[in-house]
């Protein structure tokens, strides 16, 4: 938890999601007026988000403690967990409508469909997860989290396809780190870096975290990674408490949530 | 430190393309923007475009856009301008200069120009 | 497009003397850039954000102004800033130059 780049962070939390993004001016929070938030988001490429693209961005994940400007002159910020100090205690869109004076300062809300994104929250029953531009080598630089949430009592069965991430001995430079639970602070599984593919994993519960971390040097490959829903009936009973069983690593049983 | 290494010197004729070239070196290419300023023999300075080099994006101003194409590659930090259909008015010292991506912007470095001559 | 009209387009100067340039600009800009440049050499930033000195820039450089109207000031004038200064705007497409004012020694 903390703030980084006037951003509210708890991994849970997008900094860029449905092709939506926070822009603040290089002199910081507040220093645009809606002519230069226009501006900001057409240097990019893009133009000022509409309040339903920043909504739906917001329900995939999309929190930014900020209010910054939108299309048409309205401005607003997107939460999705309520806090003492952002949000007044409310989720959605908190709106402050369209402005009349529009040399007002706040931030921007970019929406760039062609943005390069990364990560996510997904309840699908399965889906692949690639390094951002695979099977180009990634990017420097680069930081994504994709988020799993699954039903009640199901599992996630996680299976790497393809890896190649850039190899040091601590996998301190690019590396893929596993979460068995809804964030990157509890139920670490394990940091993976070089061309070895990991054994599969199976969560204890039915949400896990991925992270891709790269640094702002050598890039390599790049990976695939597929889940797969388990099903709490075919689920072996002999996978309950084992850690590895075969080239499935188990892990036992320590969150659950709704 | 931060270096951007033009290409040397070109003569072309008229109608002809070059390609002027721009390699980084001292920092992460993928992280700033690189812009093209043109100026001709004792005239003042003008913007011809940029790209973002890490998604490829780029723009040009209006009276550029059917003369200078912008690319990268990433692997090499190297940042292109190629100019087609050369007439004489495109004689000038071309530099490749880096901003930041934050806004407003501005260039912290610039490489040493390439001089274009275009002549029959 | 943001036109940047600098004031004057020549000058000269003895050393000791305070020197004062000016932009204008046709459409407000939030800040204000100003480069160096002398003969045959390449640019190099010399105040950013109106009022901030790149690095290596002696003190007696300073610059001001807000909105359409800014200023580069030289409080004592010596031999090596002959130069030729341009203003620049980053705030609207397309980014712009001033014309420049060339500064000399008298």
């Known amino acids: 938890w903390g703030f980084k780049n006037g951003i509210f962070h708890n991994s849970i939390w997008l900094e860029q999601a449905a092709g939506v993004y926070h822009r603040e001016a290089r002199a910081g929070r507040y220093k645009l007026t809606y002519a230069e938030a226009k501006a900001v988001c057409e240097f990019e490429g893009g133009r000022l988000a509409t309040y339903k693209q920043l909504e739906a961005a917001r329900k995939i994940g999309f929190h930014v403690c900020a209010a910054g400007w939108m299309a048409k002159g309205r401005v607003g910020y997107p939460i999705v967990k309520p806090g003492p100090n952002c949000g007044f205690g409310k989720t959605g869109i908190i709106d402050y409508g369209i402005r009349l004076n529009r040399s007002e300062r706040w931030d921007a809300y970019c929406y760039n469909p062609h943005a390069k994104e990364c990560g996510g929250v997904f309840t699908d029953p399965k889906r692949i997860f690639k390094s951002p531009g695979f099977p180009n080598e990634y990017d420097d630089n680069q930081v994504c989290y994709w988020h799993i949430r699954l039903k009640y009592g199901q599992r996630i069965h996680l299976s790497f396809l393809d890896f190649d991430l850039e190899h040091d001995p601590g996998c301190l430079a690019d590396y893929v780190e596993i979460y068995d639970s809804y964030d990157d602070v509890h139920g670490f599984v394990g940091r993976y870096c070089g061309d070895e593919l990991p054994e599969d994993i199976i969560s204890t519960g039915n949400v896990m975290t991925l992270k891709f971390l790269s640094d702002a040097s050598v890039t390599a490959g790049g990976f695939q990674i597929k889940y797969v829903t388990v099903d709490p009936a075919s689920k072996s009973s002999q996978a309950k408490n084992t850690s590895t069983t075969g080239n499935k690593k188990f892990l036992p049983g320590r969150f659950s949530h709704l | 430190q931060v270096q951007l290494q033009q290409s040397g010197a070109e003569l072309a004729k008229p109608g002809a393309s070059v390609r002027l070239s721009c390699q980084a070196s001292?920092?992460?290419?993928?992280?700033?923007?690189m812009h093209w300023v043109k100026q001709r023999p004792r005239q003042g300075l003008e913007w011809i475009g940029y790209?973002?080099?890490?998604?490829?994006?780029?723009k040009c101003h209006q009276k550029f856009k059917d003369k200078a194409t912008l690319t990268a590659d990433k692997s090499s930090s190297t940042a292109y301008m190629q100019l087609s259909s050369l007439t004489y008015e495109d004689s000038a010292v071309y530099y490749c200069?880096?901003?930041?991506?934050?806004?407003?912007?501005?260039?912290?470095?610039w490489g040493q120009g390439t001089t274009l001559t275009v002549s029959s | 497009e943001n036109v940047l009209t600098q004031s004057p387009a020549i000058m000269s100067a003895s050393p000791g003397e305070r020197v004062t340039m000016t932009c204008s600009a046709t459409?407000?800009?939030?800040?204000m850039h100003w480069y160096q440049q002398k003969s045959s050499t390449s640019p190099k930033l010399w105040i950013y954000?109106?009022?901030k000195l790149a690095s290596g820039v002696p003190g007696r450089f300073s610059g001001s102004g807000s909105g359409n109207s800014y200023s580069l000031t030289i409080s004592s004038m010596e031999a090596e800033d002959v130069a030729t200064y341009y203003c620049?705007?980053?705030?609207?497409?397309?980014?712009?130059f001033g014309a420049g004012t060339k500064l000399e020694l008298k």
């Open positions: 200069a880096r901003s930041t991506s934050g806004y407003p912007y501005y260039f912290d470095s």
């Open positions: 001292g920092y992460t290419f993928t992280s700033y923007w």
């Open positions: 790209i973002i080099p890490s998604s490829g994006y780029t």
């Open positions: 459409s407000s800009v939030s800040f």
């Open positions: 954000d109106t009022s």
């Open positions: 620049f705007q980053g705030s609207w497409y397309p980014l712009t």
